[in-house]
């Protein structure tokens, strides 16, 4: 049958629309299904019917149940059912699955999170937004009309977002909260000729003899998952593994994703107990993918 699930929290406002939509001029009668008792239309009641809307101001756990709406046109009567569940407020931050609205996905280009069901309420901006129960602060977050916009979306923006607003009915204010999950999806990936972010080509780095130093080779290869992308160091044109000097070690390349979505790799060359002969070597940062090879050279000099 034409039925819709609705849910809310005790002591908050809940407004439910009849699932059987009709033209605005049609009369709508509401009943509590278990008793077939008519829902009053007088606004002085805590629970009252207002056309296509059923209002709980505020809701109580005991209001849970199935409500019948009958929409009457001059020649047709059509029935809908609203299955309402009111839950006790959660003592902790955790929002259980049964209180979650549909999950939305976002990406770098589109990161709107709409506040669920808000169109049913008489509310005024701005909305308050929370992520995993923490109030959202900072310039990346913009509460705009009935949605939240996140600038420069990153994967760690995924999580549960709660909107909180005030519903006003005849001068009385009621709180409403609604939570939905937000997931971040990768934009369509692509690969580019490698771009080395560091070091600059023909750079010179000053070092202290006898000290340790690190050289970082950082290169980006495009967006999204990359089929082939390697970053490595060479000494005088030779692989580190072929250069028999235990003081000089190359770390495994670390994948890194920046807020702009670029797929980058960092590889660190660690030189322990810098010696005079290390200043004579040519250190090449190599970035390789299917498009080709890019090389930046760096040398060491005494401080």
């Amino acid at each position: 049958k034409f039925s819709k699930q609705s849910w809310g929290l005790e002591n908050e406002a809940l407004i439910v629309r009849c699932p059987r939509q009709g033209k605005s001029s049609y009369i709508v009668d509401w009943y509590y299904s278990q008793t077939n008792k008519s829902i009053p239309t007088q606004e002085r009641n805590r629970v009252f019917a207002s056309g296509q809307l059923l209002k709980f101001l505020p809701a109580e756990v005991a209001d849970s149940g199935i409500y019948t709406c009958i929409v009457r046109s001059p020649t047709f009567n059509r029935t809908g059912y609203a299955n309402v569940t009111i839950y006790k407020k959660q003592p902790d931050c955790n929002v259980p699955d049964y209180l979650m609205y549909s999950t939305v996905s976002g990406s770098e280009k589109n990161s709107k999170i709409y506040c669920p069901t808000i169109d049913l309420y008489n509310w005024t901006a701005p909305l308050e937004w929370f992520k995993n129960c923490q109030a959202l602060q900072g310039s990346r977050y913009k509460a705009h009309k009935s949605f939240l916009v996140i600038d420069n979306v990153m994967t760690d923006d995924a999580g549960d977002y709660t909107c909180k607003f005030i519903h006003n009915e005849n001068g009385a204010n009621y709180s409403v909260t609604a939570t939905r999950s937000f997931t971040v999806k990768d934009e369509q990936g692509f690969s580019l000729f490698p771009v080395i972010r560091a070091p600059a080509h023909n750079e010179t780095k000053e070092v202290e003899i006898g000290e340790n130093t690190n050289l970082t080779c950082s290169a980006c290869f495009g967006k999204g998952a990359q089929f082939l992308a390697t970053v490595q160091w060479q000494l005088n044109g030779n692989k580190i593994t072929d250069f028999s000097e235990p003081r000089i070690q190359q770390e495994e390349g670390q994948n890194q994703s920046f807020s702009n979505g670029l797929a980058c790799v960092n590889t660190v060359l660690r030189i322990a107990d810098v010696k005079e002969e290390d200043l004579l070597l040519r250190y090449d940062c190599l970035a390789l993918n299917l498009h080709g090879l890019r090389r930046h050279t760096i040398r060491l000099s005494r401080k």
Partner: antibody, heavy 123, light 107 residues
């Protein structure tokens, strides 16, 4: 009393054009969705096209898309179906009908129908 | 599109007998299903809407039942004027589709 009266049917050659009209009376025409349904001789009913009352949005069956155009003139309480590039398989009785309920994006039954007008496509 | 299959194609019965017509949808239409009656040379006439509600002016001998994919139109006791073709129609989604019809004829 609600009445729908189709006109404009007739014999037309393949590739030709025809414009059907449906004059409505007895109800507030402008707020209702209106529909064309056709019935080939000895066959069943086939939805052809819908035009919304509020907003005037249109939709078409795949079999007529790009060839037929539904329109309405609310000031004249009249529904139209412009049929171009007619084919033999378009031969049918064309009925206009009223959807008494539907809201944007939804559909309902057809509670009033005209008596139909016969379109014959033949060389 | 949603395909509606009606059975039987023809039903041969005598006045006073009970007629049971079936309509099966290729996917769920909830209760968004209607039944129409059509007599030769006439336009269809709405009998049942929302699967089980009688339209205004339709005699109580016509009843509809079902939900989801299986629906039934029952005429409890056939009157002479009930011999006609009956169509089911779904309106849950575009395009609106009709069944191919069941002809109820006099035995």
């Amino acid at each position: 009393e609600v009445q729908l009266l189709e006109s404009g049917g007739g014999l037309v050659q393949p590739g030709g054009s025809l414009r059907l009209s449906c004059a409505a009376s007895g109800f507030t025409f402008s707020i209702y969705d209106m529909i064309w349904v056709r019935q080939a001789p000895g066959k069943g009913l086939e939805w052809v096209s819908t035009i919304r009352g509020e907003g005037g949005g249109t939709s078409y069956a795949d079999s007529v898309k790009g060839r037929f155009t539904i329109s309405r003139d609310n000031s004249k309480n009249t529904l139209y179906l412009q049929m171009n590039s007619l084919r033999a398989e378009d031969t049918a009785v064309y009925y206009c009908a009223r959807d008494p309920w539907s809201t944007e994006g939804s559909f309902f039954v057809l509670d009033y129908w005209g008596q139909g007008t016969l379109v014959t496509v033949s060389s | 599109e949603i395909v509606l299959t009606q059975s039987p194609a023809t039903l041969s019965l005598s006045p006073g007998e009970r007629a049971t017509l079936s309509c099966r949808a290729s996917q769920s239409v909830d209760d968004d299903l209607a039944w129409y009656q059509q007599k030769p040379g006439q336009a269809p006439r709405l009998l049942i809407y929302d699967a089980s509600n009688r339209a205004t002016g339709i005699p109580a001998r016509f009843s509809g039942s079902g939900s989801g994919t299986d629906f039934t139109l029952t005429i409890s006791s056939l009157e002479p004027e009930d011999f006609a073709v009956y169509y089911c129609q779904q309106y849950i989604t575009a395009p609106l589709t009709f069944g191919q019809g069941t002809k109820v004829e006099i035995k």
